[in-house]
Structure formats: structure tokens, C-alpha cells
């Protein structure tokens, strides 16, 4: 399918002008190639009428032009002084006329209505309000005022000053007669319907002295705003319906093949399951305006969308609406990234988030989509490092690999972490993407101890066990903070407080702190990566305590207060009937450090890797 997009149908009246906007993917080639507007003939050929290279056909001379807007990926064709002969089938496109990079546009130019002299024309959008002004002479001031609608040769009474209201206008029309001295009455019609369209007649008095005034009411369906967005990207529909419906339920719906409108989301809590996890209805402003954001755009999201207001939260005739025609461009600049990421309980996930590579300095965010009511997405982490408290020690946003992608790591997974998350920046909103985290059966691949307690001044050595499949990966330990996870520098950086010395074929990588200081307390992550692409992680919390008095720490295996089948153990692991119940934080992410000799003074932190004959259980 062609990635060029424009209005399918354009209608106007003789003598008027039209402006037709066509969209194209703003690649370097497309921005600079020829743009054209051509008319399809009976033979199927398309004859150029105007192009971006300056050509204008004789038929269009002096009344048409084509302007390219390469920075937006659009071009606009303006045609003035329309005649009935301009009705027909056209194409807007790129390159050569027959190549297929085009969009079909139907133009219909109709004859303007033959209106009686002195007819006032009122042009109003469906659902809105019109006020028809009806002047009269002093002598008709005390007489009956009325509004009729002309249908063919007959006139149907709509409303009069004797309290008659035509049933078709019930509860939405009123006739106002001003105080003395003002020789004008008004008829106000609310919530206009398409069927209200037509010629009306104001009348004051009767007989030959009556006052009459013709009014032509044109009720327009809102012209759909064309919206051109990339596959996998995001779209925002801004809906401003006016103060008169500020306190009425709002909705967004999509027009289906039967020309009815299926609710996508509304403020009454309804949401189409096809948009689960990727839609938000943002709170209304005081003026009743609101917006709907849809991320992770799919080709099947294309179509005509309407937003509106009605107490039922769905489309009803005569209520204000706004319209959009959404086109999803498959030649997307947004890279493919997994829409579902799977992790195991106790394990971790590393999520790749795309952003506009032109905005490398933008702030990056990650939020959790919550479906309740209209949906919300509270931020969990941002590139400046702020993390929601309940994610402390298990969530980090990394700028790597960069160049249009950042990484979010979440570990110590539980079933409650399953759900939809959004990647976003404070820059281009079209690059918002959605990822679903699913928690599946299995064991974490990286194994670290549960709660670890270090003693001030002593050596601490924590192992991280990994399966053979990670032998080709780079292993690391890092110390977590709310601004990221600081990897320990490698050995070739010279003497330092921390160094890495990891045998690449090993299946055990260890963190050594020697001697332990107060500053060592906190979360450590053990992880694997390939270049700038992060894999699994496991986290361990290291608590630091003062040296205990000798002999006060240990519990005898035969201690009387332990149940006969239960041993009280030292690290948060209870052993009952020979079954170890691991502390839920047994698996966590960490940084890698190297082993030093017996009671060595040497470097304070190091990483070591050593081979292991058995490999830990693997979930994959």
C-alpha cells in the first residue's frame, strides 16, 4: 500500500477554493523528489495539472499552485475559482505519475443553492448551536412570532411565540422576544443535527403586513483532520468541544464499515480491548477539552475517529463532535522492538526503548500503564534518576545503547510486575511506545544469595552463578543508586578502589569488598551484557554491621528452641524438612568484583570469575 495519504473526498461549491494537503514519509529522497497533482482520465492515465517543479497546466493557469513542506513531509495543492468541470478523480503523489506513490482524491464541485434575495446564511458544525435573527416592524411587535422550515413547496412550523415546539426540535430550541424597543426576535437551536440543514423562514404577524426573513442553515459534518503517523509510534487526538458540554461524559470512537461508531474509550470507564495497555484519556481541562493518546500504532488502527460528548459516553445525533482520519505509515522511522518481554519470578527483564535519535539530550522516562477509569501512566523512573520508592534497588534507566535507544532494567520480578509499560521522552511525543511484561514459569538464570550482611573492616565475597549459555557474554557487577548502576571499573584502568578480573569462560563471577566500609551498604547487581545490550540481572542487598562480640552470633544446630524439623539459618533461608525456602530477594542484579588473597589489604572492591562444573537451572 502506498505511504502517501490525503483526503479521500473533497467537496466545494462553484466559485470557491479548496486546499488539499497530502502527506508522505519524510525520507531524504521523498523530501526532494517531484510532487504532483494529476487528473485521472477515462484511459486510466493521470494527466499532470500542477507539480513542484513549476509546471502548471493551461486549465489551472493563474488559479492553482503546489507547495512542498519537506520538513513536515507534506505538500499542499491550492485550487481557486472552482467550476463544475473540476469535479472528478485526482491523485496527489511523488515521483512519476504512474509509479504508485500516490493517493486517490475525489473532488466534487456542486452548484451553490439558489437562495431568495436577502437570505442570511448560517454555517454551523453538527452538534453546535445556531442563533437565527429575525427582524420585524413595530406594528408586528405584539403579534405572533414563528419560525418555519421550508420542505419542498411546503412550510412546516418549527416554533412560535404561543409555545408550540415541533417534536423534532423538542428540548433543543427556544424563541426569545426582546424587551420593548428592540425589533428583532431570535431562535436558538442547540445540538444541531444534519437533518436540521435547510431553508428556514422567520415570520412576525400575519396577512399582507407580516415580516419575513429567509435563513439558510448549513449543518456541516466536521471535516476530518488528516493525521499521518508512523507504525509503532503514537498519536494524540486533542478534542475541544466547548464549554457547553464541559460537564458531559466524553468519548473517542472509531467509525466502522456500517458507518456506526464503536467506542474506543470514554470517561465512563469503557475501553476497547484492542487498545488495552496503549491508550490514555487525559483529564479534562476546565473548558471541557481533553486528549486521547494511543501508542504502539498498528496498521489496523487506521480509520476515521470521532470524539464527542454525551451522557451515555457514545455517539448520539445532535451532539458536538470532532473528526480525524488516521493513516498509519508502514515505512516507519520507529525501529522494531519487542512488544512483549517475558521474565520469570525472581528474574529480570531488560527493555529496549526507542526515541527520536535527533533528540539524544531529551529526558527519558518509563511509566506503568494503569487501566482504571480513563487510564493513567505514573512515572517509575527517569533519566535524571528519580525512581518511585517501591522500585528501589530493582529498576534502572540506562542511556545505552544510545543513538535512538535507551534501556530499562527491572529485576526481582514478581507476578505483580506483569502489565503494560510506556517508554517516552520529553521530546517528540510520536515516539511513545508500549511494551508488555509477562511473567512466565521458570527459574532465574543468574543466581545470587539472598540477604547479605557484611561486617565492617572484613572481606565480603558474593558469588553470582550463571549458566553456560552466558559464557560468551560480558559479566559485570554494579552498585545501584537512584541515578543508575555504577559498574566497577576494569583492571586495566590502573590501581583503583575497584577492579574487574573475569575469566570469560567462567560460570561464576564474584564481588569482593575488602575491607568493608559503611559506604558499601546498598543494592548490588550482577548482570550479563553483549556490548551495549543488556541481558539478565540479579540483585542482592548488602547490609553492613559492626563486628559482633565473638561467640554471640551462632545458634547451635541442636538449640532447644528450634523445632525438631526446622533449622534457623543465617541468611534469610529457612530449612524445613530438608526443603530450602529461599528469601524472595534471593535473586537480584549486581556488579562484579575480583577475589583477593587471605586477609589481603589490597584493593577495596574487586571482581572474580571462576569455572563451575554444574550449571544452575535455566528458564530458557
Amino acid at each position: 500500500k502506498s505511504p502517501v495519504f490525503g483526503p479521500q473526498e473533497v467537496s466545494s461549491v462553484e466559485g470557491n477554493s479548496v486546499s488539499i494537503k497530502c502527506y508522505y514519509p519524510p525520507t531524504s529522497v521523498n523530501r526532494h523528489t517531484r510532487k504532483y497533482w494529476c487528473r485521472k482520465g477515462a484511459s486510466g492515465r493521470c494527466i499532470t495539472l500542477v507539480s513542484s517543479e513549476g509546471y502548471v497546466s493551461s486549465n489551472y493557469a493563474g488559479r492553482a499552485n503546489l507547495t512542498n513542506f519537506p520538513e513536515n513531509g507534506t505538500f499542499v495543492v491550492n485550487i481557486a475559482q472552482l467550476s463544475r468541470d473540476d469535479s472528478g478523480h485526482y491523485k496527489c503523489g511523488l515521483g512519476i505519475n504512474s509509479r504508485g506513490l500516490s493517493f486517490d482524491v475525489s473532488l466534487e464541485v456542486s452548484q451553490g443553492p439558489e437562495l431568495p434575495n436577502g437570505t442570511e446564511v448560517y454555517t454551523v458544525d453538527v452538534g453546535r448551536t445556531v442563533t437565527i435573527k429575525c427582524p420585524f416592524k413595530t406594528e408586528n411587535a405584539p403579534k405572533t412570532k414563528a419560525l418555519y422550515k421550508k420542505i419542498g413547496q411546503t412550510s412546516v412550523l418549527v416554533i412560535d411565540s404561543r409555545n408550540y415546539v415541533n417534536p423534532n426540535y423538542k428540548d433543543r430550541i427556544r424563541l426569545r422576544i426582546p424587551g420593548t424597543g428592540q425589533l428583532i426576535f431570535t431562535v436558538v437551536i442547540d445540538r444541531l443535527r444534519l437533518s436540521d440543514h435547510g431553508l428556514y423562514l422567520c415570520q412576525a404577524g400575519d396577512g399582507s403586513n407580516r415580516d419575513e426573513k429567509n435563513a439558510d442553515l448549513q449543518v456541516l459534518e466536521p471535516e476530518p483532520e488528516l493525521v499521518y503517523e508512523d507504525l509503532r509510534g503514537s498519536v494524540t487526538f486533542h478534542c475541544a468541544l466547548g464549554l457547553e458540554v464541559a460537564n458531559v461524559a466524553k468519548f473517542l470512537c472509531r467509525v466502522n464499515s456500517r458507518e456506526t461508531c464503536d467506542v474506543v474509550i470514554n470517561t465512563l470507564g469503557k475501553r476497547d480491548s484492542a487498545f488495552e495497555g496503549r491508550i490514555l484519556l487525559n483529564p479534562q481541562d476546565k473548558d471541557g477539552s481533553f486528549s486521547v493518546v494511543i501508542t504502539g500504532l498498528r496498521k489496523e488502527d487506521e480509520g476515521r475517529y470521532l470524539c464527542g460528548a454525551h451522557s451515555d459516553g457514545q455517539l448520539q445525533e445532535g451532539w458536538p463532535i470532532q473528526a480525524w482520519q488516521l493513516f498509519v505509515n508502514e515505512e516507519s522511522t520507529i525501529p522494531r522492538s519487542p512488544t512483549v518481554v517475558k521474565g520469570v519470578a525472581g528474574g529480570s527483564v531488560a527493555v529496549l526503548c526507542p526515541y527520536n535519535p535527533k533528540e539524544s539530550q531529551s529526558l527519558k522516562y518509563w511509566c506503568l500503564w494503569e487501566g482504571a477509569q480513563n487510564g493513567r501512566c505514573p512515572l517509575l523512573v527517569e533519566s535524571q534518576g528519580l525512581v518511585q520508592e517501591q522500585y528501589e534497588g530493582r529498576l534502572s534507566l540506562l542511556q545505552e545503547p544510545g543513538n535512538g535507544t535507551f534501556t530499562v532494567i527491572l529485576n526481582q520480578l514478581t507476578t505483580q510486575d506483569a502489565g503494560f509499560y510506556w517508554c517516552l521522552t520529553n521530546g517528540d511525543t510520536r515516539w511513545r511506545t508500549t511494551v508488555e511484561i509477562k511473567i512466565i514459569e521458570g527459574e532465574p538464570n543468574l543466581k545470587v544469595p539472598g540477604n547479605v550482611t557484611a561486617v565492617l573492616g572484613e572481606t565480603l565475597n558474593i558469588p553470582c552463578h550463571f549458566p553456560c549459555k552466558f559464557s560468551s557474554y560480558e559479566k559485570y557487577w554494579c552498585k545501584w543508586s537512584n541515578t543508575g548502576c555504577q559498574t566497577l571499573p576494569s583492571q586495566d584502568e590502573g590501581p583503583s578502589e575497584a577492579f574487574v578480573n573475569c575469566d570469560e569462560n567462567s560460570r561464576l563471577v564474584s564481588l569482593t569488598l575488602n575491607p568493608v566500609t559503611r559506604a558499601d551498604e546498598g543494592w548490588y547487581w550482577c548482570g550479563v551484557k553483549q556490548g551495549h545490550f543488556y541481558g539478565e540481572t540479579a540483585a542482592v542487598y548488602v547490609a553492613v554491621e559492626e563486628k559482633k562480640v565473638a561467640g554471640s552470633r551462632y545458634v547451635s544446630p541442636a538449640k532447644a528452641d528450634a523445632a525438631p524439623d526446622e533449622k534457623v539459618l543465617d541468611s534469610g533461608v529457612r530449612e524445613i524438612e530438608n526443603k530450602a525456602i529461599q528469601d524472595p530477594r534471593l535473586f537480584a542484579e549486581e556488579k562484579v568484583v575480583a577475589d583477593t588473597g587471605d586477609q589481603a589489604g589490597g584493593s577495596r572492591a574487586s571482581v572474580d570469575s571462576s569455572s563451575s562444573e554444574e550449571q544452575g537451572g535455566s528458564s530458557k
Epitope: 565475597n461 551462632y554 563451575s612
Partner: nanobody, 125 residues
Framework: QVQLVESGGGLVQAGDSLRLSCAAS??????????MGWFRQAPGKEREFVAS????????YYADSVKGRFTVTRDNAKNTVTLRMNSLKPADTAVYYC????????????????WGQGTLVTVSS
């Protein structure tokens, strides 16, 4: 999880040597993932730390009372840890326990997760 079985205890004369072994079995993680330690408990006394060794064998730590006399080693291929005791004294008489930990901590506060049943060492004068 890990099962630990000690062996090698017995009655010896003061000044003699003895070698205790601890065999580990179980498939939670491989043996060389665990730091190993030795403890002892004399009749009527608290259990006390004797020695520890990290999973690679590169780091060891001893209680002051045994430093220079006892040596701890491990053979990861055979899933065993050994405590070589020289110049034994009557004060060394105790039940000796082998322990395994998920991480290594130097000092006398070895973070044991798993314990053996113990083997008795008696040193007569």
C-alpha cells in the same frame, strides 16, 4: 539444597595431626558456588568459628586460636573441603561441624546456611 557429611574425627594424642573431610552433595547449585567453613563446639560451650574458605580457595580465614596450626583447603572437582589440624591440644577437643554459605565473609562471623551433623575430635594429654 546442600547436604554436608563430616568424617575423619577420632581420638589422638596431644601434638598429633588429624585431617577432617566434609563431603557435599545436592544439586541446588554447584559446590564451588558455596563458601565453606568449619566450626567446633566443646562440651558445655558455645559453638565457635574455626576456619573458612571462599569458593575458589583463594581466600581463607582462621580463628586466632588455630592460626598457624590448622589449614583449610577445598577440592571443587570432588566436592570436598578439608581441615588439616596439626599440633593438636586438649583444648581442641570438640564436635567439629562443616558449614556452607551462599556468600563469603571473612572474620569469625561466617554466614552459614547449611550444616553437617558433626564429627567428634578428642585430644588426650
Amino acid at each position: 539444597q546442600v547436604q554436608l557429611v563430616e568424617s575423619g574425627g577420632g581420638l589422638v594424642q596431644a601434638g598429633d595431626s588429624l585431617r577432617l573431610s566434609c563431603a557435599a552433595s545436592g544439586r541446588t547449585l554447584s559446590f564451588d558456588t558455596y563458601a565453606m567453613g568449619w566450626f567446633r563446639q566443646a562440651p558445655g560451650k558455645e559453638r565457635e568459628f574455626v576456619a573458612s574458605i571462599d569458593w575458589s580457595g583463594g581466600t581463607t580465614y582462621y580463628a586466632d586460636s588455630v592460626k598457624g596450626r590448622f589449614t583449610v583447603t577445598r577440592d571443587n572437582a570432588k566436592n570436598t573441603v578439608t581441615l588439616r589440624m596439626n599440633s593438636l591440644k586438649p583444648a581442641d577437643t570438640a564436635v567439629y561441624y562443616c558449614a556452607a554459605a551462599q556468600y563469603y565473609r571473612s572474620g569469625t562471623s561466617f554466614p552459614a546456611n547449611y550444616w553437617g551433623q558433626g564429627t567428634l575430635v578428642t585430644v588426650s594429654s
